[in-house]
């Protein structure tokens, strides 16, 4: 009883709680390096709370402190694959607002087929988070290959 | 002064800081895949705090989003041991209840003798995770290049 | 009853949300094999709430379990190069007190130019942390490649 | 540190069987895995079968089905049995042993791996 009562005064939200674990939805057309995501209980076990999906993309509501968290698995791919279409380089990065671009993580395959990796940056609410993959080879849409995540940690 | 009165009334168990950090016991018998996992002060940095081992296993105490990290070393492993052995696969799924089997997380070691990854997921009381080894390496037993965890993260 | 007494009055920064994000500042010299880290929000964005740096070295303030991660690339690195200059390997651990020193995460580059990983661990006030790259080969300081850092989780 | 004793080799006739015998001595407790491999002339050493400390078994694709893997723990021995022999199975066949060891005044594992001297099996009409 007493727990609902606190619950009452400071609505979980409030904690900023803000999550989201996204699932590839495809390559994006022609020129465009970007991967398209989405997220849902419908989709899976991907699942938005707090920032949103605008077309595609990310997008930040509560400013904060993230820890962003990427894998890319690449789908017919074999060690030798990797090297011979070197490089395929994995970048994510804040694309909007553009006074605000800039690269936040950047992996290159080599000679994997899998890059993953996670870290801690400021975001600000109306940041969008886009992930460029460069090179030739295609992402895996296998759910537990590729996922894409953001984790409020502190304000 | 509302928010430090709903502070008031929050054990700080409440607040759901279910977390685990494993070390690898051993790997399975006969045919099995499973990795068997241990922790506790004992035994060095390892600890469980809230979920429970069962017969090696992770199982979920509390509902919520989780941050699952994992990290692998081969044992006796070089880029060339790992692409002749190749492929080697680690896996981490919801193996019971079977209602709920899933995998959740997959890497190949392709040319590398280190896999490492992250994801948030959606887990509920009863859920035991397991990680799936399979190839023919070894898995290293150091505890600073083998462990498995989760944290939770929100309800 | 004393523990609830003291919850009533923890504002949310006593609740233990320290958190570092590092970016390379150089590595050490001679027969050093430290990376020497770099952090706050003129330098772009690396910061520190909470543990310090001591001599380019992450000093934590606050007991508790801890999530530590970190992503070192290698800054003119091929597959080739990588594989000819190994072992090439990152090490985190406690390097002060001796008496608390311990490697707690540890890999090797192999055939890769980039490791990233991520482990949780109890870490005490004091501890000061330090990340040993050994090996001929020189880690990039671009932010997006390079960067090591830790979060509290809960006590 | 463990040595690794072979026997059992020979030859047999397509589809015949063969038993093969690796002894271990030494500091047998610090032993991880125990296999066998095998070397046809002019190709790589590849991994035939495996067995860990808890019992554990992997195989080959090539052999699955016809070669089984198994201990003896009183008696320090891994054996293979080779059912449903080819002439492809021809080769020369080595015991492997992965050893974990604890660094001396350290938490932490060392990893070696020892060979037996081999043992010749020719499948042959």
């Known amino acids: 009883q007493r727990f609902a009562q606190a619950q009452q005064q400071l609505p979980l939200e409030s904690l900023g709680w803000d999550v989201a674990e996204l699932q590839l939805n495809h390559t994006g057309p022609q020129q465009d390096p970007r991967l398209y995501w989405q997220g849902g209980p419908a989709l899976g076990r991907s699942f938005l709370h707090g920032p949103e999906l605008d077309k595609g993309q990310l997008r930040i509501h509560r400013d904060g402190i993230y820890m962003v968290h990427i894998q890319v698995t690449l789908a017919i791919c074999s060690s030798t694959t990797a090297s011979r279409h070197h490089p395929t380089t994995l970048a994510v990065g804040i694309c909007s607002p553009a006074s605000r671009s800039i690269s936040l993580l950047r992996l290159s395959f080599h000679q994997g087929c899998t890059i993953a990796s996670q870290r801690l940056t400021p975001l600000a609410r109306g940041d969008t988070l886009c992930t460029n993959l460069t090179g030739t080879l295609l992402p895996s849409r296998n759910t537990d290959e590729t996922f894409f995540g953001v984790q409020w940690v502190r304000p | 002064q509302r928010f430090a009165q709903a502070q008031q009334q929050l054990p700080l168990e409440s607040l759901g800081w279910d977390v685990a950090e494993l070390q690898l016991n051993h790997t399975g018998p006969q045919q099995d895949p499973r990795l068997y996992w241990q922790g506790g002060p004992a035994l060095g940095r390892s600890f469980l705090h809230g979920p429970e081992l069962d017969k090696g296993q992770l199982r979920i105490h509390r509902d919520g989003i989780y941050m699952v990290h994992i990290q692998v070393t081969l044992a006796i492993c070089s880029s060339t041991t790992a692409s002749r052995h190749h492929p080697t696969t680690l896996a981490v799924g919801i193996c019971s209840p079977a209602s709920r089997s899933i995998s959740l997380l997959r890497l190949s070691f392709h040319q590398g003798c280190t896999i490492a990854s992250q994801r948030l997921t959606p887990l509920a009381r009863g859920d035991t995770l397991c990680t799936n080894l399979t190839g023919t390496l070894l898995p290293s037993r150091n505890t600073d290049e083998t462990f498995f965890g989760v944290q939770w993260v929100r309800p | 009853q004393r523990f609830a007494q003291a919850q009533q009055q923890l504002p949310l920064e006593s609740l233990g949300w320290d958190v570092a994000e590092l970016q390379l500042n150089h590595t050490g010299p001679q027969q050093d094999p430290r990376l020497y880290w770099q952090g706050g929000p003129a330098l772009g964005r690396s910061f520190l709430h909470g543990p310090e740096l001591d001599k380019g070295q992450l000093r934590i303030h606050r007991d508790g379990i801890y999530m530590v991660h970190i992503q070192v690339t290698l800054a003119i690195c091929s597959s080739t190069t990588a594989s000819r200059h190994h072992p090439t390997t990152l090490a985190v651990g406690i390097c002060s007190p001796a008496s608390r020193s311990i490697s707690l995460l540890r890999l090797s580059f192999h055939q890769g130019c980039t490791i990233a990983s991520q482990r949780l661990t109890p870490l005490a006030r004091g501890d000061t942390l330090c990340t040993n790259l050994t090996g001929t080969l020189l880690p990039s300081r671009n932010t997006d490649e390079t960067f090591f850092g830790v979060q509290w989780v809960r006590p | 540190q463990v040595q690794l004793v072979e026997s059992g080799g020979g030859l047999v006739q397509p589809g015949g069987s063969l038993r093969l015998s690796c002894a271990a001595s030494?500091?047998?407790?610090?032993?991880?895995?125990m296999g066998w491999y095998r070397q046809a002339p002019g190709k790589q050493r590849e991994l035939v079968a495996l067995?860990?400390?808890?019992?554990?078994?992997n195989y080959a694709d090539s052999v699955k089905g016809r070669f089984t893997i198994s201990r003896d723990n009183a008696k320090n021995t891994v054996y293979l049995q080779m059912n449903s022999l080819k002439p492809v199975d021809t080769a020369v066949y080595y015991c492997?042993?992965?050893?974990?060891?604890?660094?001396?005044?350290?938490?932490?594992?060392?990893?070696?791996?020892?060979w037996g001297q081999g043992t010749l099996v020719t499948v042959s009409s």
């Open positions: 030494g500091s047998i407790f610090s032993i991880y895995a």
């Open positions: 067995i860990t400390n808890s019992g554990g078994t």
């Open positions: 492997n042993a992965v050893e974990e060891e604890v660094v001396a005044g350290t938490d932490r594992y060392r990893y070696l791996e020892v």
